[in-house]
């Protein structure tokens, strides 16, 4: 025999009692498949945490983040602090990129400015807290009669750290 | 949705060489670092280093610097975890995870086995 | 770089409190984030920047830093909290984390 309890659509859950018929979600509940035996508590977009979708019987609530705060996590499940760019987050707040770093995002960690002499090249435009530094051609490529510049390309040595 | 997928099992023999990969999907893959983390057959995790894809730095734990390569191509997305030369005590699960404190997303993993 | 020195076991009678210890040097000037890890699958966070619960996690799980040790916190175990935990943290010193040894979490009876 076929549990009708399957017949219960979504927004509704199946009672325990013999008839089993199908019950309505209370408030802060939904149930978003069929047959379920219960309702799930709707997600509560609290703190750092707004409210992107409300909760319906059929559907859990969505969260996003306060302004100022990123999503992290699927269907955002955490919110990180925003920094501004050249700046990265530490336990004591958003703190300026050290010299010879930068961070182009809102958020993440500095990382050390390209070096364009690994490459062979010079800097064709100096780096900030923001922005990396443009790498140009070879000093030997700006000589009076060099011939061919090689586009810009970014080197660092593998596993270097800023100090 | 956000994906990390990981190449699958690999059995290699000592002295070989192996890149594994890991595709992100469902986000700016440029922009958010990634970590490769270790975990040894019935041991712990251990961190051995971060790429950030969109312009290839990478930092390296000082436990695995010299033993292996990270490095990506953003344009598919994908980063890599190399060795030019395996050992048996390279037999492990390597994960990638987003991220370079707070990991919020990982792969399935990929199990490498070196026996000869 | 920091070590983080975990207990490699801890037991726990049903509906009593769990608690994991995280040391390291100061670690209580950095984030501690913890993962919870169950067999065959990849470790999932269950708290971040030292006491912030991801939405999903259950409110049994908290989470303390200060000084040398950051603390896991899990009142009310249940027996499917019974899985490896791991501390970690991103040091700006070597700009690397690192792990703890992880503490395997079981539930008697």
């Known amino acids: 025999i076929q549990d009708s309890c399957s017949k219960c659509p979504a927004g509704t859950f199946c009672g325990k009692n013999k008839s089993q018929i199908c019950i309505p979600c209370p408030p802060n509940s939904f149930s978003s498949t069929s047959g379920q035996k219960a309702c799930d508590i709707c997600r509560q977009c609290e703190g750092v945490f707004r409210t992107k979708k409300v909760c319906s019987s059929t559907s859990n609530a969505e969260c996003d983040c306060i302004s100022g705060f990123h999503c992290l996590g699927a269907g955002c499940t955490m919110c990180e602090q925003d920094c501004k760019q050249g700046q990265e987050l530490t336990k004591k707040g958003c703190k300026d990129c050290c010299f010879g770093t930068f961070n182009d995002q809102k958020r993440g960690i500095c990382r050390p400015w390209t070096n364009c002499s690994l490459d062979g090249k010079s800097v064709l435009v100096n780096g900030t807290k923001e922005r990396d530094v443009v790498c140009g051609p070879s000093p030997a490529d700006l000589s009076p009669g060099a011939s061919s510049v090689t586009p810009p390309a970014p080197a660092r040595e593998p596993g270097h750290s800023p100090q | 949705q956000v994906q990390l997928v990981q190449s699958g099992a690999e059995v290699k023999k000592p002295g070989e060489s192996l890149k594994i990969s890991c595709k992100g999907s469902g986000y700016s893959f440029s922009t958010y670092w990634i970590s490769w983390v270790r975990q040894m057959p019935g041991k712990g995790l251990e961190w051995m280093g971060k790429?950030?894809?969109?312009?290839?730095?990478?930092n390296y734990s000082p436990s695995f610097q010299g033993q292996v390569t990270i490095s990506a191509d953003k344009s598919i997305s994908t980063a890599y975890l190399q060795w030019s030369s395996l050992k048996a005590s390279d037999t492990a699960m390597y994960y990638c995870?987003?991220?370079?404190?707070?990991?919020?997303?990982w792969g399935q993993g990929t199990l490498v086995t070196v026996s000869s | 770089d920091i070590e983080l020195t975990q207990p490699p076991s801890v037991s726990v009678a049903p509906g009593q409190t769990a608690r994991i210890s995280c040391s390291g040097d100061n670690i209580g000037d950095q984030y501690a984030h913890w993962y919870q890890q169950k067999p065959g699958q990849a470790p999932v966070v269950v708290i971040y920047q030292d006491k912030n619960r991801p939405s999903g996690i259950p409110e049994r799980f908290s989470g303390s830093n200060s000084g040398n040790t950051a603390t896991l916190t899990i009142s009310g175990t249940q027996a499917e909290d019974e899985a490896d935990y791991y501390c970690s943290t991103y040091t700006f010193v070597g700009f690397t984390t690192v792990f703890g040894g992880g503490t395997k979490l079981t539930v008697l009876g």
């Open positions: 790429i950030y894809p969109g312009d290839s730095y990478t």
């Open positions: 995870a987003r991220g370079y404190g707070i990991f919020d997303y």
